[in-house]
């Protein structure tokens, strides 16, 4: 069966300066390929996190994505600012040249509250 990307939260609210977790789990690790988080959709979407060796300031993975059986690709965003507001998508790709997007989660909207 086709891999599913599940984002259970429709939205999260977080106070500016605090941290928030965006949950994402997969039903399978196959086909082989990366998982990436984006804010927004279409051509203008912004890469927020990639489960690779790249470093993203303020964004970290919640569980150890290098473990073979791990299906949790949740991220934590620290020191949230009003500019972090938007809808975040967890996206599964199939490895290739280039990688091909095969499944996206339903999106989680982040609301940033004034502290």
């Amino acid at each position: 069966t086709e891999v599913k990307v599940i984002q259970p939260e429709k939205s999260v609210s977080v106070a500016a300066g605090d941290s928030t977790v965006l949950n994402c789990t997969l039903t399978s690790l196959l086909p082989v390929g990366p998982i990436r988080w984006y804010r927004g959709v279409g051509q203008s979407r912004q890469l927020i996190y990639s489960f690779t060796t790249e470093h993203f300031p303020r964004v970290t993975n919640v569980s150890d994505a290098t473990k073979r059986s791990n299906l949790d690709f949740s991220i934590r965003i620290s020191n949230v600012t009003p500019e972090d507001a938007g809808t975040y998508y967890c996206v599964k790709f199939q490895r290739g040249s280039p990688d091909t997007e095969i499944q996206s989660g339903g999106g989680t909207e982040v609301y940033v509250l004034a502290k």
């Epitope: 599913k4 599940i6 984002q7 259970p8 939260e9 429709k10 939205s11 999260v12 789990t25 039903t27 339903g106």
Partner: antibody, heavy 119, light 108 residues
């Protein structure tokens, strides 16, 4: 106080159409996703359809896909379910249910309206 | 589609007794599970969400537990108004949202 009031149910022949309405009050209607859930006589609850607050996102159960259409009019605080090509197995009490703002569970329900499909 | 199986189908108990209702998911739904109460002629009422959090106004004799695939709704001491049908619902996977088949709690 949140109120959801369904209307439009009744007896209809197989193959015919019916439109249900759900009038909402007591909350900012356009900010919430709302659903139709049904219960056939002597059976359990069955999710039917979902529409997002803006009306842009819509889902249907496989059992009604292609026959039922969910819509909303945020200016009238009203949810609709257009039911076409009705079958005997669509006989049920139809509930309008408001989702929680963060998760897809239902924190408020209407009293329901009975749809009977019979010749 | 995630399938929820509730057991038993019917529970016959006396007022004051403890009721234990089970809901099993065909795959993990973590703690994204809700419980509802339904009485004849009335709208369903949310009791529990997040597997164990009581909804507003729900008496503390109702409690939920479990995670993953096994969940329990416990009514510590049945009151006359608690005799009803109870449903679990998963909201982990996006639609279709699924309900269990229900457990009827009836007076013995």
């Amino acid at each position: 106080e949140v109120q959801l009031v369904e209307s439009g149910g009744g007896v209809v022949q197989p193959g015919r159409s019916l439109r249900l309405s759900c009038a909402a009050s007591g909350f900012t209607f356009s900010s919430y996703d709302v659903n139709w859930v049904r219960q056939a006589p002597g059976k359990g609850l069955e999710w039917v359809s979902l529409i997002s607050g803006s009306g842009e996102i819509i889902y249907y159960a496989d059992s009604v896909k292609g026959r039922f259409t969910i819509s909303r009019d945020n200016s009238k605080n009203t949810l609709y379910l257009q039911m076409n090509s009705l079958r005997a197995e669509d006989t049920a009490v139809y509930y309008c249910a408001k989702e929680n703002n963060r998760y897809r569970f239902f924190d408020d329900w209407g009293q329901g309206t009975l749809v009977t499909v019979s010749s | 589609e995630i399938v929820l199986t509730q057991s038993p189908g019917t529970l016959s108990l006396s007022p004051g007794e403890r009721a234990t209702l089970s809901c099993r998911a065909s795959q993990s739904v973590y703690t994204y599970l809700a419980w509802y109460q339904e009485k004849p002629g009335q709208a369903p009422r949310l009791l529990i969400y997040g597997a164990s959090s009581r909804a507003t106004g729900i008496p503390d004799r109702f409690s939920g537990s479990g995670s993953g695939t096994e969940f329990t709704l416990t009514i510590s001491s049945l009151q006359s108004e608690d005799f009803a049908v109870y449903y679990c619902q998963q909201y982990y996977d996006r639609p279709p949202l699924t309900f269990g088949g229900g457990t009827k709690v009836e007076i013995k």
